[in-house]
């Protein structure tokens, strides 16, 4: 699982007298914020489904796994987790489902050990380009992030203010080249229509990329060539019609790759011939025997692996002089 987990079975709840204590001084070693549960043994703090409207100021310095899920945070300001002394051990931060709609530049600064961040299920209408890099320099200090989970962060359609949501997310991923060490990126369920062409080339360490349940129609301009470490590519439940030769060759050239292509509306016409040939030969596609045609109507539900070139025809396009009205 990509979420921080805890082996803790016993948590100490915060004492009532701490409920209103907001102190600029370092927290006591065994202090637990109001409305949270803490386990020093497991280095874990859970502030879950408590309608918190701000990140607690008095987080214990020992925290390694922090769950802030199911809250009412709305905004993550710059330095939302900056503390004195810093939260030097914090490695896994889960903010999913906390009604965040704005993440500002430098929101995750001063977290030197942060390897795993989950912002899923927040309608991020305003994700700063410098949310993860922390600075607007052309090359930022490398982020320690290894795993970034951004599933279902798309706001409602009428709240996108005519901005490209894909562009906003990609700008945050690429700013300052801070995420060069990122190994897992999950972007499922975000209504992505396209993948900007430069995004993958600048994330060379990726091992796992999840783009499932989006609205991707084509991968024609997406290059996988640089992703030599890529082990899994999830493209299930998109709107892919066909994969062309360039994409097929690039995928085949990746040494460790497993590709997931289920539930796409494959168009089984003459343009599908190369992909069918490739599917029959390749070992990289998981569950390839489940892939079926969606169009044209006469081909619906036919298994791609069972097709031959005679099945894959295109209706001839008549020259204008022969067309009838």
């Amino acid at each position: 699982s990509s979420s921080p987990t805890s082996s803790a079975s016993s948590f100490s709840s915060s004492a009532p007298f701490l409920a209103s204590a907001v102190s600029a001084q370092p927290p006591l070693p065994d202090q637990c914020p109001a409305l949270c549960e803490c386990s020093e043994a497991a280095r874990t703090v859970k502030c879950v489904n408590r309608n918190l409207t701000e990140v607690p100021t008095d987080l214990p310095a020992y925290v390694r796994n922090l769950f802030l899920t199911g809250n009412q945070l709305a905004v993550l300001p710059a330095g939302a987790f900056a503390r004195r002394p810093p939260l030097a051990e914090l490695a896994a931060l889960n903010l999913s489902g906390s009604r965040l709609d704005e993440v500002r530049a430098g929101a995750f600064e001063h977290l030197p050990s942060l390897r795993q961040l989950d912002l899923s299920h927040n309608p991020l209408a305003d994700l700063s380009p410098f949310a993860f890099s922390g600075s607007n320099a052309s090359v930022s200090a490398p982020s320690p992030l290894v795993e970034l989970i951004l599933n279902h962060i798309v706001p409602p359609e009428d709240e996108r203010q005519n901005r490209s949501f894909e562009g906003m997310v990609v700008a945050a991923l690429l700013a300052g080249r801070a995420l060069q060490g990122l190994r897992r990126l999950e972007l499922a369920s975000n209504h992505f229509l396209y993948l900007p062409r430069d995004v993958l080339a600048q994330l060379p360490s990726l091992r796992h990329l999840d783009l499932s349940n989006n609205s991707l129609v084509s991968l024609t301009y997406v290059s996988f060539r640089n992703l030599t470490h890529l082990e899994s590519l999830h493209l299930e439940d998109n709107a892919l019609k066909v994969l062309h030769n360039g994409t097929l060759a690039e995928l085949q050239g990746l040494p460790h790759i497993r590709v997931f292509l289920d539930n796409n509306p494959w168009v089984c016409d003459c343009h599908m011939a190369d992909m069918v040939t490739w599917l029959k030969e390749t070992e990289v596609v998981q569950g390839k025997d489940r892939l079926t045609c969606a169009y044209p109507e006469k081909m619906r539900n036919r298994v791609l692996l069972e097709l031959n070139s005679a099945d894959l025809d295109c209706d001839p396009i008549l020259p204008p002089s022969l067309q009838t009205s």
């Epitope: 945070l73 009604r99 706001p155």
Partner: nanobody, 122 residues
Framework: QVQLQESGGGLVQAGGSLRLSCAAS????????MAWFRQTPGKEREFVAA????????RYTDSVKGRFSISKDNAINTVYLQTNSLKSEDTAVYYC???????????????WGQGTLVTVKP
């Protein structure tokens, strides 16, 4: 500048309920938060509740938690404050406000309505 118009105030018996409405003249895209404040004569305006237009996050001052509920209808640019179990100390002029931040201070909000009076009889 966005115009905000409150309605729904009135005279009510202690323990009763009122639903206040705040209609915005247009969707204030630059204002991400809508809030209710209240003010009694000679006192500073006090934060009551807030809601985010997009994510729908809500927050309340401690004295109204469990009694008041803020909600919104994006389609008609309107925010509501459902006030239940009213007490005499809830008597005040209730103001609607729009702002950029997720704050509880008077100064966090730039646009204000004219207010609607809520009177709670003991």
């Amino acid at each position: 500048q966005v115009q905000l118009q409150e309605s729904g105030g009135g005279l009510v018996q202690a323990g009763g309920s009122l639903r206040l409405s705040c209609a915005a003249s247009r969707r204030p895209f630059s204002s991400k938060t809508m809030a209710w404040f209240r003010q009694t004569p000679g006192k500073e305006r006090e934060f009551v509740a807030a809601v985010r237009w997009i994510g729908g996050a809500t927050r309340y001052t401690d004295s109204v938690k469990g009694r008041f509920s803020i909600s919104k209808d994006n389609a008609i640019n309107t925010v509501y404050l459902q006030t239940n179990s009213l007490k005499s100390e809830d008597t005040a002029v209730y103001y609607c406000a729009a702002g950029q931040t997720w704050g509880t201070k008077f100064t966090d909000y730039s646009d204000w309505g004219q207010g609607t009076l809520v009177t709670v009889k003991p």
